[in-house]
Amino acid sequence: EPKFTKCRSPERETFSCHWTDEVHHGTKNLGPIQLFYTRRNTQEWTQEWKECPDYVSAGENSCYFNSSFTSIWIPYCIKLTSNGGTVDEKCFSVDEIVQPDPPIALNWTLLNVSLTGIHADIQVRWEAPRNADIQKGWMVLEYELQYKEVNETKWKMMDPILTTSVPVYSLKVDKEYEVRVRSKQRNSGNYGEFSEVLYVTLPQMSQFTCEEDFY
């Protein structure tokens, strides 16, 4: 049966919900899928269900709620129906489904090189997604940076931080690294998508000036 796969709010001002609509092997045709929602802003379940306001903007098998339909103070319940029957249902508040857009504008600077010339430390910086209103406290983002050598498969994860820059220590000189960052709303469990990968190439020692310059 069709099921909700994800509801997501990128910035606490809009949200969208998505569902599966696979071909049902050996089952009768369910008919068109519709999404209905109610704002559960009382303790009773007597409120009317309204149909999805926008089936188009968030892509196929989705419903988009623009800012006119979104409030942080009110819990929502949504249900998928087919032929008049409910096939899936879930309830949430907007703050529970925050998944920020990826951080942007990643860049790096060299901090220092070890005396042996084998390792280097870098500072990675980025910006919050454009639609996350950080200044006003409207969103409080926590960031996770991951990095790896280009030819490796496993990413190394750094502890989550609240700032938009972090030092990465002891990278091997003459290797190329991939760095990526993602964010989540503080105290909420949902990380957003990763940023575009930042490539970090640390030139060999001969390309640096004297080591003393870094100390």
Epitope: Q43, W73, I74, P75, S93, D95, W138, V140, Q185, R186
Partner: antibody, heavy 127, light 107 residues
Framework: EVQLVESGGGLVQPGGSLRLSCAAS????????IHWVRQAPGKGLEWVAY????????SYADSVKGRFTISADTSKNTAYLQMNSLRAEDTAVYYC????????????????????WGQGTLVTVSS | DIQMTQSPSSLSASVGDRVTITCRAS??????VAWYQQKPGKAPKLLIY???SLYSGVPSRFSGSRSGTDFTLTISSLQPEDFATYYC?????????FGQGTKVEIK
């Protein structure tokens, strides 16, 4: 018993600063948003700011943005309103009030609206 | 910001009268409207939330209703303790706003 108790009000000169406190008890402070609402003498209610201490969210009325800062200390179950660059028009009784956070309606018989209020603290801005 | 236009600003009524106070939102706020009662020198008290839900412990003579962006607080039979100022409030927007208030006085 749910209680909100404000303190920190008083007389301050224009341009001065004051910090109000709102001590909460009898409910899970982290799972609510705390709002400051003020009332100028003989006037109506004006919403000032809120904080959701669990998520760290804050928001401010345009009239105080950039001058007032709301914060919370969950270990003390206390919310604060730091008021800087005070003006004569900030003279008012300041109330703190609770609004349950909708994320927790499953467990708390969620209802909306500011259900508990403090007794208020008077802030007078005058030279 | 969403404006809440409350009317009348004051009214005179007698004990036993039916009293109606209205509030109009400048844009859609769903049913995210509450009504409060305030007496002089006291903090406001929640009466109605979600436009029409009676808050626990509030007498049943108080009721709320919604028609689009128009919201109404009704006191079916005014009692002596009901003489006070009443405020509507929208909490649809993250920037919460109140109506200007309606003072209910004894005729």
């Amino acid at each position: 018993e749910v209680q909100l108790v404000e303190s920190g009000g008083g007389l301050v000169q224009p341009g001065g600063s004051l910090r109000l406190s709102c001590a909460a008890s009898g409910f899970n402070f982290s799972y609510s948003s705390i709002h400051w609402v003020r009332q100028a003498p003989g006037k109506g209610l004006e919403w000032v700011a809120y904080i959701s201490s669990y998520y760290g969210y804050t928001s401010y009325a345009d009239s105080v943005k950039g001058r007032f800062t709301i914060s919370a200390d969950t270990s003390k179950n206390t919310a604060y309103l730091q008021m800087n660059s005070l003006r004569a028009e900030d003279t008012a009784v300041y109330y703190c009030a609770r609004l349950q956070h909708p994320s927790w309606y499953y467990y708390q018989g969620y209802h909306s609206g500011m259900d508990y209020w403090g007794q208020g603290t008077l802030v007078t801005v005058s030279s | 910001d969403i404006q809440m236009t409350q009317s009348p600003s004051s009214l005179s009524a007698s004990v036993g009268d039916r009293v109606t106070i209205t509030c109009r939102a400048s844009q859609s706020v769903s049913s995210a409207v509450a009504w409060y009662q305030q007496k002089p020198g006291k903090a406001p008290k929640l009466l109605i939330y979600s436009a029409s839900s009676l808050y626990s412990g509030v007498p049943s003579r108080f009721s709320g209703s919604r028609s689009g962006t128009d919201f109404t607080l009704t006191i079916s039979s005014l009692q002596p303790e009901d003489f006070a100022t009443y405020y509507c409030q929208q909490y649809w927007s993250s920037l919460i706003t109140f109506g200007q208030g309606t003072k209910v006085e004894i005729k």
